[in-house]
């Protein structure tokens, strides 16, 4: 019995269906096919879980969280024992193993391994201003999404004709910050932060209004 090499990893957007491949070749008839799909969750690597099982002509459910979401892609018994996972959740991310036995065929590699990564687009980021908006002050524009896998990058732009940040601004796309030093009237305006990763983007807006000192009355 020989389980075919897997592609290594599968990536899928949260809520979509993932297909985890596993196929094998055997010299024996499929009279006593035994297939066990296990997962080592990324969130809890020392707690492997059963996903779905096929034994003695019957299918058995795995862990409760997979109930109603998992099945074999084809009619069993078969040499293609790939499974699907519907409505993928972040917690489904992990290393999946298919263990195949088909007596009396012994020997060979009977385990296939496939990684599953559930991707999450950035959630709507929060835009904030840190620091005084008085003329000549330094301000930091903050942008952060609570969710996003892979981790989002953040791009700030000023919504004017140029879409360029003020010349005194420095941007950190990983942290999602823009530091604007010595703000002036030209710094005022609408700023947009775009949070993006491999599967999506999300934006927030921030209105920076530089406060000029009031002329003193005599």
């Amino acid at each position: 019995l020989e389980v075919s090499e897997s592609p290594g990893s599968v990536q899928v957007a949260r809520g979509q269906t993932a297909v985890l491949p596993c196929a094998f070749s055997t010299s024996a008839a499929l009279l006593n096919l035994n297939v066990i799909w296990m997962v080592i969750p990324l969130s809890n690597a020392n707690q492997p879980e059963q996903v779905i099982l096929y034994q003695g002509g019957q299918m058995f459910d795995g862990a409760l969280r997979f109930h109603g979401r998992v099945g074999f892609t084809g009619t069993m018994p078969a040499t293609n024992v790939s499974i699907f996972i519907n409505n993928t959740q972040l917690s489904d991310t992990g290393t999946y193993q298919c263990l195949v036995n088909n007596l009396p065929d012994r020997g060979g590699r009977n385990i296939g391994v496939t990684g599953l990564t559930v991707l999450v687009p950035p959630s709507a980021p929060q835009c904030q201003i840190q620091g005084s908006q008085d003329l000549g002050s330094d301000v930091i524009l903050l942008c952060s999404s609570e969710e996003g896998i892979p981790r989002p990058t953040y791009l700030w732009e000023k919504l004017d004709n140029t879409l360029k940040l003020p010349p005194t601004a420095t941007q950190d796309q990983v942290q999602g910050t823009v530091t604007i030093r010595n703000i002036s009237a030209l710094s005022s305006g609408l700023y947009q932060c775009v949070a993006s990763n491999a599967i999506g983007t999300s934006t927030c807006l921030l209105d920076l209004q530089v406060i000029s000192p009031q002329p003193r009355s005599v």
Partner: antibody, heavy 126, light 107 residues
Framework: EVQLVESGGGLVKPGGSLRLSCAAS????????MNWVRQAPGKGLEWVSS????????YYADSVKGRFTISRDNAKNSLYLQMNSLRAEDTAVYYC???????????????????WGQGTMVTVSS | EIVLTQSPSSLSASVGDRVTITCRAS??????LNWYQLKPGKAPKLLIY???ILQSGVPSRFSGSGSGTDFTLTISSLQPEDFAAYYC?????????FGQGTKLEIK
């Protein structure tokens, strides 16, 4: 204490219907497949039906296919067997049994009926 | 379907005896065989699974052996509580099937 208690048996005429129940306690019912097994008077055991923990997969013996329906309610920790078009040969003690997947060898599994109820008698007679 | 044939159908023995019950499958079932004990009015009990593995809580006087088509259940030294009916059952294929049973009686 892990326990299965069957109920609903009784005397019924041929062609009639009966619904058996099995109340589970002492274990996480929703994590196990469940089975009905019967024993006719003076005969051996006969597997009747099984249902997976999520109710996704259901299996029947040929002798009851199309007449019996197995179901479960995980919220109520209960297993059921709806028996229609009953025949004299369905007369038996009906047991509910928990299906347990047990590891053996390097990576092999076997399912066994590891917890049983005491049974309920079903008599089909005119 | 796989047919399991148990022998003997009934057996008389005394406390302290060594008893062997056999179960033969109509085709090879590897080690996919379980043994159960049945007593009237009581819940049946799983004794051995996968032909030879003792279920938790079962006394060590019970043992199982065999593979393929021929299996045995042995009780090394009969105790009064062992007088009951014994059944083998295969989980190799669907439908799951049982042997016809062996009734163990006091001599």
């Amino acid at each position: 204490e892990v326990q299965l208690v069957e109920s609903g048996g009784g005397l019924v005429k041929p062609g009639g219907s009966l619904r058996l129940s099995c109340a589970a306690s002492g274990f996480t019912f929703s994590s196990y497949s469940m089975n009905w097994v019967r024993q006719a008077p003076g005969k051996g055991l006969e597997w009747v039906s099984s249902i997976s923990s999520s109710s996704s997969y259901i299996y029947y013996a040929d002798s009851v296919k199309g007449r019996f329906t197995i179901s479960r309610d995980n919220a109520k920790n209960s297993l059921y067997l709806q028996m229609n078009s009953l025949r004299a040969e369905d007369t038996a003690v009906y047991y509910c049994a928990r299906g347990q997947l047990l590891w053996f060898g390097e990576s092999a599994l076997i399912d066994a009926f590891d917890i049983w109820g005491q049974g309920t008698m079903v008599t089909v007679s005119s | 379907e796989i047919v399991l044939t148990q022998s003997p159908s009934s057996l008389s023995a005394s406390v302290g005896d060594r008893v062997t019950i056999t179960c033969r499958a109509s085709q090879s079932i590897s080690s996919y065989l379980n043994w159960y004990q049945l007593k009237p009015g009581k819940a049946p009990k799983l004794l051995i699974y996968a032909a030879s593995i003792l279920q938790s809580g079962v006394p060590s006087r019970f043992s199982g052996s065999g593979s393929g088509t021929d299996f045995t259940l042995t009780i090394s030294s009969l105790q009064p509580e062992d007088f009951a009916a014994y059944y083998c059952q295969q989980s190799y294929s669907t439908p799951r099937t049982f042997g016809q049973g062996t009734k163990l009686e006091i001599k």
